[in-house]
C-alpha cells in the first residue's frame, strides 16, 4: 500500500490524462481524486499505466466503492480488470453485454482465468439464463465455454440459443453434457428439412437416443465415422446391422478400422455373425449362428 503524503504543489489532477503516467505511485495516491477517476475511467484505459500504477488506481476505486464497482466503472476497466480478484468481481452486478464484451476483450487469446470465469458466472446468473446473444459472445471468445458448464447449468440454456453453437464449441463436451444439449438442439432445428437438419444436429448426436438414430438411418444421412464413434454406446447397441449400414452409408467401411473401439466393439458383440458378414468387411466377434440371445434385462423387468 502506498504511504499517504500530501500532493506536491501544482500536481493535483484536474482530469485523467497522459501526464499521470509519469507520476510516482505516491503522487498518484495523493494527487488523483477517486471520484474523478471513477467518472473518467474511459480515459484510464487509453493510458498505458504500469501494473504498479494500476494497483494504486484500483486501491482508490476500492476505497470509493467498498460494496463493489458500478457498471459505469466496470465497463471501462480495461487492463485494470486483470488486477481484479474473483472476490472483487463477486461484488459486481454486470447486466450489459457490452460490458461483458469489453472485459473479455482484455483477456482475449488467453485461457479463461478465474476472474473471467467469475465474471461470466455473475453475468449469466444475473440474466437468469444463457440467452443466444450471451452464448454467441462467450463461445466467440472461448470456444470450449459450453463444455465447461455442468449439466445443471446447461439446463438453463434455451433451445433458441442452440443456433449460436458451432461444432467446435462441443469438442470437449462429455456424454452427460450432450444428453442435456441434444433435446434442446432437436427442438431448435425441428423445422429444418432432412439434410439441413442433419448438418445442424450432427455435433449434438452424442446425446441422441436409439429411436432418433433409427429415424436418422431412414434418411440417407451418411454419418461419418467420427460422429458415429461419439454416439452413446447404449444408444448404438440396439441398432441392427441394416440400420447401421443405412446410417453410415458409404462410411460403413470405416467400421473395420474401429472394430476394437467403443461403441463399435460392443455393438459387434450384440450382432449375429451372419448379419455382420453381409457387410463384407470381415468384422468378427458377433453371436455365432444357432445361438439364442436372451435379453436378461427384459426378463428382470417382467418378473
Amino acid at each position: 500500500e502506498v504511504e499517504k503524503t500530501a500532493c506536491p504543489s501544482g500536481k493535483k489532477a484536474r482530469e485523467i490524462d497522459e501526464s499521470l503516467i509519469f507520476y510516482k505511485k505516491w503522487e498518484l495516491e495523493a494527487c488523483v481524486d477517486a471520484a474523478l477517476l471513477a467518472t473518467q475511467m474511459d480515459r484510464v484505459n487509453a493510458i498505458p499505466f504500469t501494473y504498479e500504477q494500476l494497483d494504486v488506481l484500483k486501491h482508490k476505486l476500492d476505497e470509493l466503492y467498498p460494496q463493489g464497482y458500478p457498471e459505469s466503472v466496470i465497463q471501462h476497466l480495461g487492463y485494470l480488470f486483470l488486477k481484479m480478484s474473483p472476490e472483487d468481481i463477486r461484488k459486481w452486478n454486470v447486466t450489459s453485454l457490452e460490458t461483458l464484451k469489453a472485459l473479455l476483450e482484455v483477456n482475449k487469446g488467453h485461457e479463461m482465468s478465474p476472474q473471467v470465469a467469475t465474471l461470466i458466472d455473475r453475468f449469466v446468473k444475473g440474466r437468469g439464463q444463457l440467452d443466444k446473444d450471451t452464448l454467441d459472445t462467450l463461445t466467440a471468445f472461448y470456444p470450449g465455454y459450453l463444455c465447461s458448464l455442468s449439466p445443471e447449468e446447461l439446463s438453463s440454456v434455451p433451445p433458441s440459443s442452440i443456433w449460436a453453437v458451432r461444432p467446435q464449441d462441443l469438442d470437449t463436451c462429455d456424454p452427460r453434457q450432450l444428453d442435456v444439449l441434444y433435446p434442446k438442439a432437436r427442438l431448435a432445428f425441428q423445422n429444418m428439412n432432412g439434410s439441413e437438419y442433419f448438418v445442424k444436429i450432427q455435433s449434438f448426436l452424442g446425446g441422441a437416443p436409439t429411436e432418433d438414430l433409427k429415424a436418422l438411418s431412414q434418411q440417407n444421412v451418411s454419418m461419418d465415422l467420427a460422429t458415429f464413434m461419439k454416439l452413446r454406446t447404449d444408444a448404438v447397441l440396439p441398432l441392427t446391422v441394416a440400420e447401421v449400414q443405412k446410417l453410415l452409408g458409404p462410411h460403413v467401411e470405416g467400421l473395420k478400422a474401429e472394430e476394437r473401439h467403443r461403441p463399435v466393439r460392443d455393438w459387434i458383440l450384440r450382432q449375429r455373425q451372419d448379419d455382420l458378414d453381409t457387410l463384407g468387411l470381415g468384422l468378427q466377434g458377433g453371436i455365432p449362428n444357432g445361438y439364442l440371445v436372451l435379453d436378461l434385462s427384459m426378463q428382470e423387468a417382467l418378473s
Epitope: P48, T50, Y51, E52, L54, Y79, L82, K83, V106, G109, H110
Partner: nanobody
C-alpha cells in the same frame, strides 16, 4: 513469463550520447508496452519513457527534447536514445514491460549510466 536484458550503459561526459537497448525474450507476443525507468542513488525510481505495441510513445518532461524512445517489434527490443546528457541523468536505467496475460510488470536487472562533468 518475459525476461529482459538491458545494455548500452557506461561512463560518458556531459553533453555526450548513449543508446540503451532492452531485449525481451520468453512470451514476447503478450508484450503490450515497454518502459524505461531510472533510479539515481538515494532517489525514488522514476519513469523516463514508454512505447506501446502500436508505436505510441512519450518521454518525461525532465528529458523532453533530449531522450527519445523507439521499439523494434520484430526484434522484441526497445531503445532509449539519450543525447545532451547531464550529470543529473546519472542513474541505473531499468527496462520493464506490461503484458496482456499476467498483471505484473516484468523488470530487467538495469544498466548503469554515469555522466561526468
Amino acid at each position: 513469463q518475459v525476461q529482459l536484458v538491458e545494455s548500452g550503459g557506461g561512463l560518458v561526459q556531459a553533453g555526450g550520447s548513449l543508446r540503451l537497448s532492452c531485449v525481451a525474450s520468453g512470451r514476447t507476443s503478450t508484450i503490450d508496452t515497454m518502459y524505461w525507468h531510472r533510479q539515481a542513488p538515494g532517489n525514488e525510481r522514476e519513469l523516463v519513457a514508454y512505447v506501446t505495441s502500436r508505436g505510441t510513445s512519450n518521454v518525461a518532461d525532465s528529458v523532453k527534447g533530449r531522450f527519445t524512445i523507439s521499439r523494434d517489434n520484430a526484434k522484441n527490443t526497445a531503445y532509449l536514445q539519450m543525447n545532451s546528457l547531464k550529470p543529473e541523468d546519472t542513474a541505473v536505467y531499468y527496462c520493464s514491460v506490461r503484458t496482456t496475460s499476467y498483471p505484473v510488470d516484468f523488470w530487467g536487472q538495469g544498466t548503469q549510466v554515469t555522466v561526468s562533468s
